[in-house]
């Protein structure tokens, strides 16, 4: 099943998934400038058995001013940094996810990808959550959030994480302070019906990658 | 890649109420983006004025409009709405739904700035009379 909710949102915080589960879905979006190709997959997935686990699928981007030829283009390095510089300063996980059954790793770069990776998460996904620098961590318990199915319904756990506005280095001292709760999510909205077409659109997807299904909306 | 056509537009006397639809086309799934509303007033520059992250969990609004328009979202009907209860004079615009793409390597999911969406739609007149 596929996560049909926004992962909490932490003041001064990112989060990063280490390992995707299989199933999760990575779109293939092109920097301004440059398109899919016109056979190219809309996505990618992550696909395997009980010993390997792969992302299926190739992105491809072609300049909007081309037709027919992919433009092969090393990207610059302000492009470099851009993405470079959204990824948290450290890793952080306790495990090594991407080792773990079940999951791929970060896929490598595609020529003129986008400068953000969108991803569609399935039920078990983990992400990480960490402060940005100039922000250091107060905590008391796991910097994490699980999608988790209840009821039929997907939500993401709340991470017991709080960043501060104090210079310091140190990502995560061994203070507690009492967890503040996220605004703007009211608990009426930290899940969603996941509807009965979620499997078969992804199924679908994954077998043809041409259909358009932006009117068939499965989240 | 995303097309955003914009309806629900036209007149409406001050104090009374409009809603504005937006809905997107194109080879690529309505949850992958952030969507928000922007207007432009004759002779102004366009301004925001409210967004909704991809799932519809989160909400910003400007202050001009706060209490005043919501903006909810039909992730199956590939649509989002803002809904104007109680309109003014100064609500008298062009309005633009837009759309952004977002990653948790952000720490905003909601983004407030022109420059950060990506993909547009032609616009809809609302004026408002007093």
């Known amino acids: 099943e596929l996560c049909d909710d926004d992962p909490p949102e932490i003041p001064h915080a990112t989060f990063k998934a280490m390992a995707y589960k299989e199933g999760t879905m990575l779109n293939c979006e092109c920097k301004r400038g440059f398109r899919r190709i016109k056979s190219g997959s809309l996505y990618m997935l992550c696909t395997g058995n009980s010993s390997h686990s792969s992302w299926d699928n190739q992105c491809q981007c072609t300049s909007s001013a081309t037709r027919n030829t992919t433009k092969q283009v090393t990207p610059q390095p302000e492009e470099q940094k851009e993405r470079k510089t959204t990824e948290m300063q450290s890793p952080m996980q306790p495990v090594d996810q991407a080792s773990l059954p079940g999951h791929c790793r970060e896929p490598p770069p595609w020529e003129n990808e986008a400068t953000e990776r969108i991803y569609h998460f399935v039920v078990g996904q983990m992400v990480y959550y960490q402060c940005v620098q100039g922000y250091r961590a107060l905590h008391r318990g796991p910097a994490e959030s699980v999608c988790k199915m209840t009821h039929g319904k997907t939500r993401w756990t709340q991470p017991q994480l709080i960043c501060t506005g104090e210079m310091e280095t140190s990502q995560f001292p061994g203070e507690e302070k009492p967890q503040a709760s996220p605004e703007g999510r009211p608990e009426s909205e930290t899940s969603c019906l996941v509807t009965t077409t979620d499997f078969q659109i992804q199924t679908e997807m994954a077998a043809t990658m041409e259909t358009s299904i932006f009117t068939t909306e499965y989240q | 890649e995303v097309q955003l056509v914009e309806s629900g537009g036209g007149s409406v006397q001050a104090g009374g109420s409009l809603r504005l639809s937006c809905e997107a086309s194109g080879r690529t799934l309505f949850s992958s983006y952030g969507m928000g509303w922007f207007r432009q007033a004759p002779g102004k520059e366009r301004e925001f004025v409210g967004a909704i992250s991809r799932f519809g969990t989160y909400t910003s609004y400007a202050d001009p409009v706060k209490d005043r328009f919501t903006i909810s979202r039909d992730n199956a009907k590939s649509t989002v709405y803002l809904q104007m209860n109680n309109t003014k004079p100064e609500d008298t615009a062009v309005y633009y739904c837009?759309?952004?793409?977002?990653?948790?390597?952000?720490?905003?999911?909601?983004?407030?700035?022109?420059?950060?969406?990506?993909?547009w739609g032609q616009g809809t007149q609302v004026t408002v009379s007093s």
């Open positions: 837009a759309a952004y793409t977002y990653s948790g390597s952000f720490y905003s999911t909601v983004k407030t700035h022109h420059d950060e969406y990506r993909y």
